[in-house]
Amino acid sequence: MRTEAQVPALQPPEPGLEGAMGHRTLVLPWVLLTLCVTAGTPEVWVQVRMEATELSSFTIRCGFLGSGSISLVTVSWGGPNGAGGTTLAVLHPERGIRQWAPARQARWETQSSISLILEGSGASSPCANTTFCCKFASFPEGSWEACGSLPPSSDPGLSAPPTPAPILRADLAGILGVSGVLLFGCVYLLHLLRRHKHRPAPRLQPSRTSPQAPRARAWAPSQASQAALHVPYATINTSCRPATLDTAHPHGGPSWWASLPTHAAHRPQGPAAWASTPIPARGSFVSVENGLYAQAGERPPHTGPGLTLFPDPRGPRAMEGPLGVR
């Protein structure tokens, strides 16, 4: 896991003899600077491994290195979801898991990481140069997607360590909007600071923050966020054509994903169709996902992937026993 940089607490200098306007002019840069310094970029890592025991079996592990609550994870292959990629599994923290052949087993490993075992022979079998992508929708960051594939010369049973994958996409509506505001803020801040440098400095009481504090961590996007800037979207063509969902066998029956058409993965719809919409606060989350969750209740009974989940017509809380466990 990535170690986190500890950001020093930045405090605006005391107003001293400055007037109200001067005070406001001074506070704004500090607020913007704090935003610039602390604006961490979420990352997604993907690890793909071929099992030594079964050469047609792959294990995909993905993790999210953001601070928000994960609201949906979509795993696809053959390229990013919605760009020719085929959905293999959808994992929701309260609605459970949905998977399609050749996905054998999708599971949450921790609150921020998932794993998926793929197996197959014939048409639906993955092959060594297949690209696998994981998309994490989170609040408030939006959606982040990373892709990875087996290293070309990897031996069965071996894999590259899980690192942030080279292909990372932030959904424009959610992330780039925020990034744009921050970028504008940072540019404006630099402009203000430069302008401030050429003015006689007002007499200020000494700041409680050391002079080095603002420089403690220059705001630079991480490798993954640079990938997001330089490769806003990438489609990978693989010589291995994954099976379409038309031939895939759902793991369970009708449930919260009941409205998903079987051909959804070939078009930007289905499990990830709503993800380019800015993610609202959790309270209104379901309304964004209506295409995916149809008329399902707020949560189905706790069943494993092999069991059928039926939406309860009586409404969101109708299916619950104590704390939702029946």
């Epitope: 896991m1 601070s67 599971r107 609150q111 706790h302 494993g304 992937p305 069991l307």
Partner: antibody, heavy 118, light 107 residues
Framework: EVQLQQSGAELVKPGASVRLSCTAS????????IHWVKQRPEQGLDWIGK????????EYDPKFQGRATMTTDTSSNTAYLQLSSLTSEDTAVYYC???????????WGAGTTVTVFS | SIVMTQTPKFLLVSAGDRVAITCKAS??????VVWYQQKPGQSPKLLIY???SRYTGVPDRFTGSGYGTDFTFTISTVQAEDLALYFC?????????FGGGTKLEIK
């Protein structure tokens, strides 16, 4: 209904071993991880470890490594915890719980009380 | 392993009071913290996951907050049925570790 049914209370002598069982109904244990948690009287909880019933791979807290052994039998949808070389410190309630279908322990067994007495 | 230090160990409150329980991790666990409630003679039940996401069906008087190393669980208006043991769990890194627990008693 999704449930984890645990075996009955055990009364054992110091130095002995005990095997606890946890049988799942309403879901297949192959689709989740099974974790074991220890709770001593009037104390907090200790994570013993987890097992992946699909392949038998397990992971333990170093505190329990060597004395605890987790196994599963997918044909009977049952997970087992074996504790050896028991001491009075092992007197506790042992819970099995599932993780993986959701990113938290959503279903717990009722617990098995193990009492080590001289 | 990561140590989760939970305070206080005991809370004696009256119905209607507001209570806060804290868990401090010995290193960052990001938001991978869960809060459970365990009533006497029962198995634990999930209240909060992702440090601040309230589980479906959990009354909104229960809230969680925090990120990194400092986490707080709050009951805004304690009710008689909230008498229980509350504990946090981190699943950020293995071995997973629990807080020592807070026993809430009603006057």
């Amino acid at each position: 209904e999704v449930q984890l049914q645990q075996s009955g209370a055990e009364l054992v002598k110091p130095g002995a071993s005990v095997r606890l069982s946890c049988t799942a109904s309403g879901f297949s244990i192959r689709d989740t991880y099974i974790h074991w948690v220890k709770q001593r009287p009037e104390q907090g909880l200790d994570w013993i470890g987890k097992i992946d019933p699909a392949n038998g791979k397990s992971e333990y807290d170093p505190k329990f490594q060597g004395r605890a052994t987790m196994t599963t039998d997918t044909s009977s949808n049952t997970a087992y915890l074996q504790l050896s070389s028991l001491t009075s410190e092992d007197t506790a309630v042992y819970y099995c719980t599932r993780y993986g279908y959701y990113p938290y322990f959503d279903v717990w067994g009722a617990g098995t009380t193990v009492t080590v007495f001289s | 392993s990561i140590v989760m230090t939970q305070t206080p160990k005991f809370l004696l409150v009256s119905a209607g009071d507001r209570v806060a329980i804290t868990c401090k991790a010995s290193q960052s666990v990001r938001h991978d913290v869960v809060w459970y409630q365990q009533k006497p003679g029962q198995s634990p039940k999930l209240l909060i996951y992702y440090a601040s996401s309230r589980y479906t069906g959990v009354p909104d008087r229960f809230t969680g907050s925090g990120y990194g190393t400092d986490f707080t669980f709050t009951i805004s208006t304690v009710q008689a049925e909230d008498l229980a043991l509350y504990f946090c769990l981190q699943d950020f890194s293995s071995p997973w570790t629990f807080g020592g627990g807070t026993k809430l008693e009603i006057k």
